[in-house]
C-alpha cells in the first residue's frame, strides 16, 4: 500500500516487551499534519483503533493504550495517518512493530562461558537453558531495542538450551533471556535473572550487542 502520504513512525513505551497484565503505549507520530491516526493489528478484522491526532511543534501524534496485556493483544502492529475521515485516505503504513507478551511461562537460566567477567578481546558465549521445552530463546540487552533469537537445541541432561556467541568482548552489558514456543511467537516466558557481563581491560562498560553493526561498514549482524 503506497499511501497518499509518507509513513508515520510507531514506537512502544516503555518497550515492545510487555509483561502480562501491564499496559503499553504505542505512539504513532509524523511531521505530516495528520488529523487522524489508525492502529491496526496484522490479521485482525475488527480491532483497528482510531484516535484524533494531537499537534505540537510541527509534529502530529497519537498515543494508543494497549492493555492490560493478554495473549490476544500481542502481535504485529502498524499505524497509519489520515488527513480526512470517512473516507480515510491512509498514509503508507509505519514499519511493523512486534508487541510481545512476557511473563507467561517459567523463566529460563542465563549463564556466560567462560564466565560473566572476561578479558577484553576474549570470546564470550551466553547460554540460555530451561527444563521447559522451549523451541526458541530470545536474548535481550538492556538499552537495546531488538533481541536476537536462536532455536533451542535438542534436550541435553534434561534441559533445552541455546547458545548465543557474542564474539570477542569489547564492552560489558546486562543481558536477559526469554523462552517461547514456535506456534506462539509473540508469547514469551518470564525473563531470566539478569546477567551482568563485565569486561576487564576496557574503560567503557557498554557492549555492542549482536544486533548492532559489527563494523564501520554499517552492516548489522542480525542473529535471527
Amino acid at each position: 500500500h503506497e499511501g497518499v502520504h509518507r509513513k508515520p513512525s510507531l514506537l512502544a513505551h516503555p518497550g515492545r516487551l510487555v509483561k502480562s497484565e501491564e499496559t503499553v503505549i504505542l505512539q504513532c507520530w509524523s511531521d505530516v499534519r495528520f488529523e487522524h491516526f489508525l492502529l491496526h493489528r496484522e490479521g485482525k478484522f475488527k480491532d483497528t483503533l482510531h484516535l484524533i491526532g494531537e499537534h505540537h511543534d510541527g509534529v502530529s501524534k497519537a498515543n494508543f493504550s494497549i492493555g492490560p496485556m493478554m495473549q490476544d493483544l500481542a502481535g504485529t502492529y502498524r499505524c497509519y495517518g489520515s488527513v480526512t475521515h470517512s473516507p480515510y485516505q491512509l498514509s503508507a503504513p509505519s514499519d511493523p512493530l512486534d508487541i510481545v507478551i512476557t511473563g507467561l511461562y517459567e523463566k529460563p537460566s542465563l549463564s556466560a562461558q567462560p564466565g560473566p567477567t572476561v578479558l577484553a578481546g576474549e570470546s564470550v558465549t551466553l547460554s540460555c537453558s530451561s527444563r521447559s521445552s522451549y523451541d526458541m530463546y530470545h536474548l535481550s540487552r538492556e538499552g537495546e531495542a531488538h533481541e536476537c533469537r536462536f532455536s533451542a537445541g535438542p534436550k541435553v541432561n534434561g534441559t533445552f538450551q541455546a547458545d548465543f556467541p557474542l564474539g570477542p568482548a569489547t564492552h560489558g552489558g546486562t543481558y536477559r533471556c526469554f523462552g517461547s514456543f514456535r506456534d506462539s511467537p509473540y508469547e514469551w516466558s518470564n525473563s531470566s535473572d539478569p546477567l551482568l557481563v563485565s569486561v576487564i581491560g576496557n574503560p567503557s562498560n557498554s557492549w555492542p550487542s549482536p544486533t548492532e553493526p559489527s563494523s564501520k561498514t554499517g552492516n548489522p549482524r542480525h542473529l535471527h
Epitope: F45, T48, L49, H50, Y88, Q89, L90
Partner: antibody, heavy 120, light 111 residues
Framework: EVQLVQSGAEVKKPGSSVKVSCKAS????????ISWVRQAPGQGLEWMGG????????NYAQKFQGRVTITADESTSTAYMELSSLRSEDTAVYYC?????????????WGRGTLVTVSS | QSVLTQPPSASGTPGQRVTISCSGS????????VNWYRQLPGTAPKLLIY???QRPSGVPDRFSGSKSGTSASLAISGLQSEDEADYYC???????????FGGGTKVTVLA
C-alpha cells in the same frame, strides 16, 4: 452517494462453487471494510466473514472456514465471496455490507442481495 | 440456533411503546458494543442503532437502544404502521472471532 451493486441470481448444483461480486461506488473502496452476510429463506442473518482491502485482512466465521474465500480487487472497487462445496442448505440471499475501518462490524451500507439457489 | 437470543415476535398498537430484548454472554454483548438492524420485507437490512445507543442520521428518535451487562434492548416509542419489520441485534464475539446476530424479532403493528 454510496452504492454496493451485487451480481445477479445464481442457480448451482450441489458440490459446485459460486462466486458473488459486490462493486462499490461513491467512496474510497480500499479504505472500508466489506462483510458478507447471508439469509436463508425465512431465516435470520448470518455473518460469513469480511475483508479490509487496504490491510489485506480477511476474517471468516468459524462455520465457513475452509469453504469461503473473500477477496477484493482495488482496481475495480469490487469485493468477491466464493463459497465452495455447495449444499442445499446454502440456498440463501447473500448480502455484502460496508463498515468503516475502525468500525468494521457496523454495517452502514448494504447491497441489495444476491439469491443463490442450490438444487440438483 | 442463534448466539444472541431475541424473542421471535413483538406487537403493539399505533402510538404504543415496544421493547425488544437481546441476550448474549460475556464474550459478545458483555465485552463489545451492540448494533441493531431493521429489515423491511423483501429488502436488505438497514442500520438502526450502533454502539449500543447511537442513531445514524435519518433514524427518528423514536428508536433508542441500551445495554446492560450481557443484554441489550431496542425500544420503539410511538409505534407506527411503517415500523412493521424484522429487527436484529448484532455484536462481535471474542470467542468465535466473528460477528453474531440474534435470530430476529418480527414486530407487528396491530390495527
Amino acid at each position: 452517494e454510496v452504492q454496493l451493486v451485487q451480481s445477479g441470481a445464481e442457480v448451482k448444483k450441489p458440490g459446485s462453487s459460486v462466486k458473488v461480486s459486490c462493486k462499490a461506488s461513491g467512496g474510497t473502496f480500499s479504505s472500508y471494510a466489506i462483510s458478507w452476510v447471508r439469509q436463508a429463506p425465512g431465516q435470520g442473518l448470518e455473518w460469513m466473514g469480511g475483508i479490509i482491502p487496504i490491510f489485506g485482512t480477511a476474517n471468516y466465521a468459524q462455520k465457513f472456514q475452509g469453504r469461503v474465500t473473500i477477496t477484493a480487487d482495488e482496481s475495480t472497487s469490487t469485493a468477491y465471496m466464493e463459497l465452495s462445496s455447495l449444499r442445499s442448505e446454502d440456498t440463501a440471499v447473500y448480502y455484502c455490507a460496508r463498515g468503516e475501518l475502525d468500525t468494521a462490524i457496523r454495517f452502514d451500507y448494504w447491497g441489495r442481495g444476491t439469491l443463490v439457489t442450490v438444487s440438483s | 440456533q442463534s448466539v444472541l437470543t431475541q424473542p421471535p415476535s413483538a406487537s403493539g398498537t399505533p402510538g404504543q411503546r415496544v421493547t425488544i430484548s437481546c441476550s448474549g454472554s460475556s464474550s459478545n454483548i458483555g465485552s463489545n458494543t451492540v448494533n441493531w438492524y431493521r429489515q423491511l420485507p423483501g429488502t436488505a437490512p438497514k442500520l438502526l442503532i450502533y454502539s449500543n445507543n447511537q442513531r445514524p442520521s435519518g433514524v427518528p428518535d423514536r428508536f433508542s437502544g441500551s445495554k446492560s451487562g450481557t443484554s441489550a434492548s431496542l425500544a420503539i416509542s410511538g409505534l407506527q404502521s411503517e415500523d412493521e419489520a424484522d429487527y436484529y441485534c448484532a455484536a462481535w464475539d471474542d470467542s468465535l472471532n466473528g460477528v453474531v446476530f440474534g435470530g430476529g424479532t418480527k414486530v407487528t403493528v396491530l390495527a
